[in-house]
Amino acid sequence: LKGQEFAPSHQQVYAPLRADGDKPRAHLTVVRQTPTQHLKNQFPALHWEHELGLAFTKNRMNYTNKFLLIPESGDYFVYSQVTFRGMTSECSEIRQAGRPNKPDSITVVITKVTDSYPEPTQLLMGTKSVCEVGSNWFQPIYLGAMFSLQEGDKLMVNVSDISLVDYTKEDKTFFGAFLL
Amino acid sequence: LKGQEFAPSHQQVYAPLRADGDKPRAHLTVVRQTPTQHLKNQFPALHWEHELGLAFTKNRMNYTNKFLLIPESGDYFVYSQVTFRGMTSECSEIRQAGRPNKPDSITVVITKVTDSYPEPTQLLMGTKSVCEVGSNWFQPIYLGAMFSLQEGDKLMVNVSDISLVDYTKEDKTFFGAFLL
Amino acid sequence: LKGQEFAPSHQQVYAPLRADGDKPRAHLTVVRQTPTQHLKNQFPALHWEHELGLAFTKNRMNYTNKFLLIPESGDYFVYSQVTFRGMTSECSEIRQAGRPNKPDSITVVITKVTDSYPEPTQLLMGTKSVCEVGSNWFQPIYLGAMFSLQEGDKLMVNVSDISLVDYTKEDKTFFGAFLL
C-alpha cells in the first residue's frame, strides 16, 4: 500500500517512506584466509570479518559463509577493495620469438548468486597486469557501483589468487553494501 | 520520539523521517600544501579547499584545520582520491646479493579521530609500490567505504609524502563524506 | 512548499519527504565504441549501454547520445570505472642524454556540461602513467564522488584513448550516478 504526502494543491503518491537508519547495510573487513577447496573454473571467494573492529552488519543484512545476503529488493551500492602483495613478477623476462609474454595479473570480482539462476553474475571486475622489476610489490584494486538486487541474492568477492591478498589490516581489504 | 507513517490497516514505527537534502555532506578539493611540522609517527595530513569551485560543506558538516567534523551520529560513506606524481623511483636499481629492494611506495589513509579515544583509527588505506623505470610517473589512489561515525568524530586524509601530491586540479585530488 | 513532520513540542520543517526508490538513478555499461569525429582539444566521450544486462536508468534519469541527463537538482554520487588495455608502452626505452621520457598515460575524466555555460566542467579525473616492460598490460581507473548538480546538467565520460578501452565485459567498464 502506498504512503501519501499531502500538499495543498495536489497529492503525490510514493512507495512507503522509511527512515534511512533502518536500511540494510554491511561493511566487512579482511581476515586471514584458510586453505579451502575452490570451485572449478571460478576464482576463490574471500571470507570476511563481520562484527569486530570496523566491521558490521545491520538491519537484516547478514553475512554467512563468504556471502552477504540481501534481505530486501532495491538498489544497492556495493564496493570492495582488495590489496594484493607479492614478490617480483616474471612478466618482463626476455620474450621468446619477439612475442610479448602473457603478464602476471591480479583480479577482483564482486559476484552475485541468485539461487533460482544457475550461473553467478559478475557485477564488478577489477583486473590489472603486474609487471614489476626487481622488487616486491603491493597495490590495491578498488571497485564500487550501484545494482538492482533482489531479496535472497547473495554477494561474494572472488580473487585470482588468495595467497596474494594482504590480510594484515582491516583498512586495506574490505567489502560492503548498502541499500540506497 | 518516533515519527509515524499511517496506513489504513497497520501502523509502522520508524526513526524520525527526514529529508535527504538536509543531511550532512561535504566534498573537499586539493590545495597546495605548505611545509609544516608533522606529528611524529604519523603520516602528514592534507589540508583542503572547502568552498571554492566544486568544494562544499553543508548541513552542519564543517571543515576546520584539516578535519571534517561529523555533526551527527550515523552511517557515512567516506571517500578520497589522491593523485601522486614523482620522478623516477629508485626501487629498480641493481639488487644486492640477489635480494629484492624495498620498493618506493605511496600511501593514502583516511583517519578518524575521536577526542575521547587516545589513538586515531585508520578507516581506509590505499598503499602502492612505485617502481617506474626511466620516466616520470603519476597515478591516483582511490578509497571509499561506509562507516558508523559518532557526533564529534573528525576525519582527515594522511599521505606518505605530501610533496608528491598533485595539487594542480580540483578533480584529481579530493575528499568527501555524506550521511546515508 | 515545504513538507512538515509533526512532533508534540515543536515543528521541524524539511524539504518534501520522498521515497528513496523514487530517486533518479543510472548504471551504464560498456559497449564497443564506433569511430567518431572527436571534438578538438577534448578527450573523446564514451557511449554506453543503458538497458541490457546490468545497465538501467530509472526515475527520469535518461541516457542519450553519450550523456546522462540530470532530471532534478540535488547532490549526486557519480562514479565510473574504465579498464584500459594495450601493448607494451615505449616510455621505458633508453633515455636520451639521461633524461626521463615523458611517459605514456591513460586518463578518465567525468565531465559536466551545462547548456547555459560555455565550458564543460571536469568533475573527476583519474590519470596514470603507463610504463610496462616487455608485455601487454591492462588496468582499471576508478572514480567516484559527490557533486551538487542542477536539473538539465549532462554528464559524460571522456578518455584519453578510446582504442585502449576494454569493451569486452559489462563489469569492467561502467558509469553511474544516483541522487542522494
Partner: antibody
Framework: EVQLVQSGAEVKKPGASVKVSCKAS????????MHWVRQAPGQGLEWMGW????????NYAQKFQGRVTMTRDTSISTAYMELSRLISDDTAVYYC???????????WGQGTMVTVSS | DIVMTQSPSSLSASVGDRVTITCRAS??????LNWYQQSPGKAPKILIY???RLQSGVPSRFSGSGSGTDFTLAISSLQPEDFATYYC?????????FGPGTKLEIK
C-alpha cells in the same frame, strides 16, 4: 615560522670548491624536497637540482652533473650544496628553496653570494 | 630540456593599470606552471601555482591562466609594490626551468 637560513658569502679561486649550507626550521625537514637555485648578477634564475632529505636521493640538472653534490644532515635539519671545479661563470647568489610540492618553491633562503675570482 | 620564453622582456606601466605577461613552454607542461615575483636584492616569492591557483596570502589582483604550452599572468590593478621582475617556471619535468623574466617598471 618556516625559515631557511644559509651560510655566509664566500670568495673562491677558480678550480676550488665551495660548500653552502641551509638550515631549516619551523617544519618537518625530511618531509619536503630541498632545491638549489642560483642567480648570476643581473641574470635570471637557474635550477641546479634537488635532494630528498628523507631518502637522500638527488636529481641534478645535466649542466651540473659531476660537479655538484647535494647532501643533508637530518639530525640538524641542514642541507648542503657543494660545487667543485669553480669557474668565474659560477659567480652567483645561491638559494636553497623548499615547497609543499616537489616542483615549486614556497620558501627561500636569504641567498649566499659566491664570488669566483683569481 | 623544456625551454620557457616570456614576453615582453620588460614593460612600463602606471599604478592602477592592468598588465599581462605571457609565458610559453617548448612542449606541453599540462598545468605544472608557477609564477614568481622578485624584487631587487630579495629572494623570489611564489604568486601562482598550478597555472591558475593563487598562493595563500597573495593579493587577488594577481591571476594566472593557461595550460599546455601557453600561460598568462595578469595583474588587474597595479600597486606600487608590484613593480618587480616576474618569472615563470615549469614543474612538469626535470630539469625544472625558468623563463628569462619580465621586468615591470613604473612609467
Amino acid at each position: 615560522e618556516v625559515q631557511l637560513v644559509q651560510s655566509g658569502a664566500e670568495v673562491k679561486k677558480p678550480g676550488a670548491s665551495v660548500k653552502v649550507s641551509c638550515k631549516a626550521s619551523g617544519y618537518t625537514f625530511t618531509g619536503y624536497y630541498m632545491h638549489w637555485v642560483r642567480q648570476a648578477p643581473g641574470q635570471g634564475l637557474e635550477w641546479m637540482g634537488w635532494i630528498n632529505p628523507k631518502s637522500g636521493g638527488t636529481n641534478y640538472a645535466q649542466k651540473f652533473q659531476g660537479r655538484v653534490t647535494m647532501t643533508r644532515d637530518t639530525s640538524i635539519s641542514t642541507a648542503y650544496m657543494e660545487l667543485s671545479r669553480l669557474i668565474s661563470d659560477d659567480t652567483a647568489v645561491y638559494y636553497c628553496a623548499t615547497g609543499g610540492s616537489f616542483d615549486a618553491f614556497d620558501v627561500w633562503g636569504q641567498g649566499t653570494m659566491v664570488t669566483v675570482s683569481s | 630540456d623544456i625551454v620557457m620564453t616570456q614576453s615582453p622582456s620588460s614593460l612600463s606601466a602606471s599604478v592602477g593599470d592592468r598588465v599581462t605577461i605571457t609565458c610559453r613552454a617548448s612542449q606541453s607542461i599540462s598545468s605544472y606552471l608557477n609564477w614568481y615575483q622578485q624584487s631587487p636584492g630579495k629572494a623570489p616569492k611564489i604568486l601562482i601555482y598550478g597555472a591558475s591557483r593563487l598562493q595563500s596570502g597573495v593579493p587577488s589582483r594577481f591571476s594566472g591562466s593557461g595550460s599546455g604550452t601557453d600561460f598568462t599572468l595578469a595583474i588587474s590593478s597595479l600597486q606600487p609594490e608590484d613593480f618587480a621582475t616576474y618569472y615563470c617556471q615549469q614543474g612538469d619535468n626535470t630539469p625544472f626551468t625558468f623563463g628569462p623574466g619580465t621586468k615591470l617598471e613604473i612609467k
